[in-house]
Interface confidence: low
């Protein structure tokens, strides 16, 4: 008789999850000399240990501590780019501006980007059928707790001027419930961080509004100011031109507003 299995509301573990994590780890350590010391088998064992045999609604940050320890990485604290609801452009930017880093440019972020995973209580099986959805099932699921943990650590490491890329096409440009709004904003360290600079990315070519005056941006400014961190905001009217000007800042067309 087949054993009863919990049906969750979210998609199951990404197929070939163990192989994907291991392959990504090998690839990352090959191309980042400063991480060449990392033993990818140990990284996978620590990752697995965080959720295998545990109830997928009862995962804690402590479960991920062995993985966090193995994945400890120093990125230049003044070169951090946070993002919310605009991952692709943020990643394009760090590919061009190669001395800046998103969370997904670090080993742990790179390993887990776009993947889903969960286990089952008291069995060593990975659940490929379904995993808990953050809203419909529970927030303390393996994926959500992982991103909360690494995002907190990433924000805590930031210093000087921290940049955040926000999606100006969304109804809530700054969303208090996003990872940026609920975790990263609150873990920037006022002793180290002087300024949070928001880049609001416009979607439409004809959109000339000042989205820095948006009520949700004002809300972000208020939260940041209360934490004794300065806030500044820039409209990026032309994201395509913005990337081009990052690559070729001396281009004559880059002196005008982007």
């Amino acid at each position: 008789v087949p054993r009863w299995r919990q049906q969750w509301s979210g998609p199951g573990t990404t197929k070939r999850f163990p192989e994907t994590v291991l392959a990504r780890c090998v690839k990352y350590t090959e191309i980042h000399p400063e991480m060449r010391h990392v033993d990818c088998q140990s990284v996978w064992d620590a990752f697995k240990g965080a959720f295998i045999s545990k109830h997928p609604c009862n995962i804690t940050e402590e479960d991920y501590q062995p993985l966090m320890k193995l994945g400890t990485q120093t990125v230049p604290c003044n070169k951090i780019l946070l993002w919310s609801r605009i991952k692709d452009l943020a990643h394009q930017f760090t590919q061009v501006q190669r001395d800046m880093f998103t969370l997904e440019d670090t080993l742990l972020g790179y390993l887990a980007d776009d993947l889903t995973w969960c286990g089952e209580f008291n069995t060593s099986k990975i659940n490929y059928q379904s995993c808990p959805d953050w809203r419909k099932d529970c927030s303390n699921n393996p994926v959500s707790v992982f991103w909360k943990t690494v995002s907190r650590r990433f924000a805590e490491a930031a210093c000087d001027v921290v940049h955040v890329m926000l999606n100006g096409s969304r109804s809530k440009i700054f969303d208090k419930n996003s990872t940026f709004g609920s975790v990263e904003v609150h873990n920037l360290q006022p002793e180290k961080v002087q300024t949070l600079e928001a880049w609001v990315i416009h979607g439409g070519r004809e959109d000339s509004r000042d989205l820095c005056q948006d009520p949700t941006i004002k809300e972000l400014e208020s939260i940041i100011s209360k934490r004794n961190i300065q806030f500044s905001c820039k409209n990026i009217y032309r994201p395509d031109k913005f990337l081009q000007c990052v690559k070729n800042p001396e281009d004559s067309s880059c002196t005008s507003e982007i």
């Epitope: 690839k27 090959e30 191309i31 394009q92 590919q95 061009v96 395509d240 081009q244």
Partner: antibody, heavy 119, light 106 residues
Framework: QVQLQQSGAELAKPGASVKMSCKAS????????MNWIKQRPGQGLEWIGY????????EYNQKFKDKATLTADKSSGTAYMQLSSLTSEDSAVYYC????????????WGQGTSVTVSS | QIVLTQSPALMSASPGEKVTMTCSAS?????MYWYQQKPRSSPKPWIY???NLASGVPARFSGSGSGTSYSLTISSMEAEDAATYYC?????????FGGGTKLELK
């Protein structure tokens, strides 16, 4: 300035092997991936694979897995590609090109090595 | 593997004419890259990350697109633009090129 200098044309018999070279200069050899691309006469481009010289890590297009072997010599700043069990299908120009792993495109290319397989 | 289909395979344009060529991917890719190749020469990087011009590429060139549909546009054709243009994707191994669009001067 950056240069990728490839070895001269090769004429080989079916079943034989050839090993071509790509000498890099003007940049830090170990900081970039080295790609190899095939172009048959009058045809398009086909990616064979890359090597990361700092660690000798390679990744291949499955199609060329048993055909091409990529190596690199850090001390001389030279990448190599060996092609084995040659057939007429392997007659082509082979380019090496460097790739900065976080973005851009393959930004510098060698002049190409022509391989002719004929009995 | 992701197949990139370029169209048209061959086209001609007069000086000053606007030119658009397309590259269609068999499944979604994150970004598209374009290379220019002239006879008896190595390919040159032309556009990266879909819309960014490589160093030295004239501003009359532009790139756009997302998902499975990408294009390269020349706002005003010049004689030196006659060449074959290849699109290429890095999203999935094997990294693949399109079959090329040969652009001739009319």
């Amino acid at each position: 300035q950056v240069q990728l200098q490839q070895s001269g044309a090769e004429l080989a018999k079916p079943g034989a092997s050839v090993k071509m070279s790509c000498k890099a200069s003007g940049y830090t050899f170990t900081n970039y991936w080295m790609n190899w691309i095939k172009q048959r006469p009058g045809q398009g481009l086909e990616w064979i694979g890359y090597i990361i010289p700092s660690t000798d890590y390679t990744e291949y297009n499955q199609k060329f897995k048993d055909k091409a072997t990529l190596t690199a010599d850090k001390s001389s700043g030279t990448a190599y590609m060996q092609l084995s069990s040659l057939t007429s299908e392997d007659s082509a120009v082979y380019y090496c090109s460097r790739y900065p792993y976080r973005g851009y495109a393959m930004d510098y290319w060698g002049q190409g090595t022509s391989v002719t397989v004929s009995s | 593997q992701i197949v990139l289909t370029q169209s048209p395979a061959l086209m001609s344009a007069s000086p000053g004419e606007k030119v658009t060529m397309t590259c269609s991917a068999s499944s979604s890719v994150s970004y598209m890259y374009w290379y220019q190749q002239k006879p008896r020469s190595s390919p040159k990087p032309w556009i990266y990350l879909t819309s960014n011009l490589a160093s030295g590429v004239p501003a009359r060139f532009s790139g756009s697109g997302s998902g499975t549909s990408y294009s390269l546009t020349i706002s005003s054709m010049e004689a030196e633009d006659a060449a074959t243009y290849y699109c290429q994707q890095w999203s999935t191994n094997p990294w693949t090129f399109g079959g090329g669009t040969k652009l001739e001067l009319k």
